[in-house]
């Protein structure tokens, strides 16, 4: 995973997961991989 | 960046109440669940509610189900949760997380 | 509940030296998807957890490389290949496969 940008200096990329596997369902419109939620319930 | 900050703690006597607020910037919070944790004076830290991101479904352990209530206003990417008829075993610092990134925690204290 | 079992409660190390820490869970940890939501915090004094591998194996920003995870289905483990004395701390696993969100009771890392 990215974790910086290079443009005139390095920039902190404040990552985001898909964290909790009940969200994997719930967050497919979202980019996998860089957006996390809490629990979602059913 | 993505910060949480929570508020609303404080000290209430046994059988009291209080809302504790969290507020969330640097990301889509109308898009994705929140919990609250609380961690105990021994440290141990265990999941209190979780609320699903249209605010349509919740999660309590039997701990506090029927006294703690989770909700948010996703206009104001707010999160809450609302405790009524607390014990001392309440005692704990409560966070605000949403898995990666947590708040700074608010304190809650129940004694007479 | 997925009941998370730490060991060992304290783990006193030297300076440079490896650490490892041992994480097992009461099922499996393995996800519909074939994922394995298996994490690791480490919470230091006055702060909140804050989320050092996720996913078994997977550094979060920012996270050195000294540290590592491994394992698979219920037996998880986390090592530091050098200590530094900024890893002192209470390391966390926790699940996030089943609901409810559950943790385990932490190791405190501590200078020999």
């Known amino acids: 995973d990215a974790e910086f940008r290079h443009d005139s200096g390095y920039e902190v990329h404040h990552q985001k997961l898909v964290f909790f596997a009940e969200d994997v369902g719930s967050n497919k419109g979202a980019i996998i991989g860089l957006m996390v939620g809490g629990v979602v319930i059913a | 960046e993505v910060q949480l900050v929570e508020s609303g703690g404080g000290l209430v006597q046994p059988g009291g109440s209080l809302k504790l607020s969290c507020a969330a910037s640097?990301?889509?919070?109308?898009?994705?669940?929140m919990s609250w944790v609380r961690q105990t004076p021994d440290k141990r830290l265990e999941l209190v509610a979780s609320?699903?991101?249209?605010?349509?479904?919740?999660y309590y352990p039997d701990s506090v189900k029927g006294r703690f209530t989770i909700s948010r206003d996703n206009a104001k990417n707010t999160l809450y949760l609302q405790m009524s008829s607390l014990k001392s075993e309440d005692t704990a610092m409560y966070y605000c997380a949403s898995g990666d990134y947590w708040g700074q925690g608010s304190t809650l204290t129940v004694s007479s | 509940d997925v009941v998370m079992t730490q060991t060992p409660l304290s783990l006193p190390v030297s300076l440079g030296d490896q650490a490892s820490i041992s994480c097992r869970s009461s099922?499996?940890?393995?996800?519909?998807?074939?994922?394995?939501?298996l994490h690791w915090y480490l919470q230091k004094p006055g702060q909140s957890p804050k989320l050092l591998i996720y996913?078994?194996?997977n550094r979060f920003s920012g996270v050195p490389d000294r540290f590592s995870g491994s394992g698979s289905g219920t037996d998880f483990t986390l090592k530091i290949s050098r200590v530094e004395a900024e890893d002192l701390g209470v390391y966390f696993c926790?699940?996030?496969?089943?609901?409810?969100?559950?943790f385990g009771g932490g190791t405190k890392l501590e200078i020999k």
């Open positions: 926790s699940q996030s496969t089943h609901v409810p969100w559950t």
């Open positions: 099922q499996s940890l393995v996800y519909s998807n074939g994922d394995t939501y």
């Open positions: 640097g990301f889509t919070f109308s898009s994705y669940g």
């Open positions: 996913r078994v194996s």
């Open positions: 609320i699903n991101s249209n605010g349509g479904s919740t």
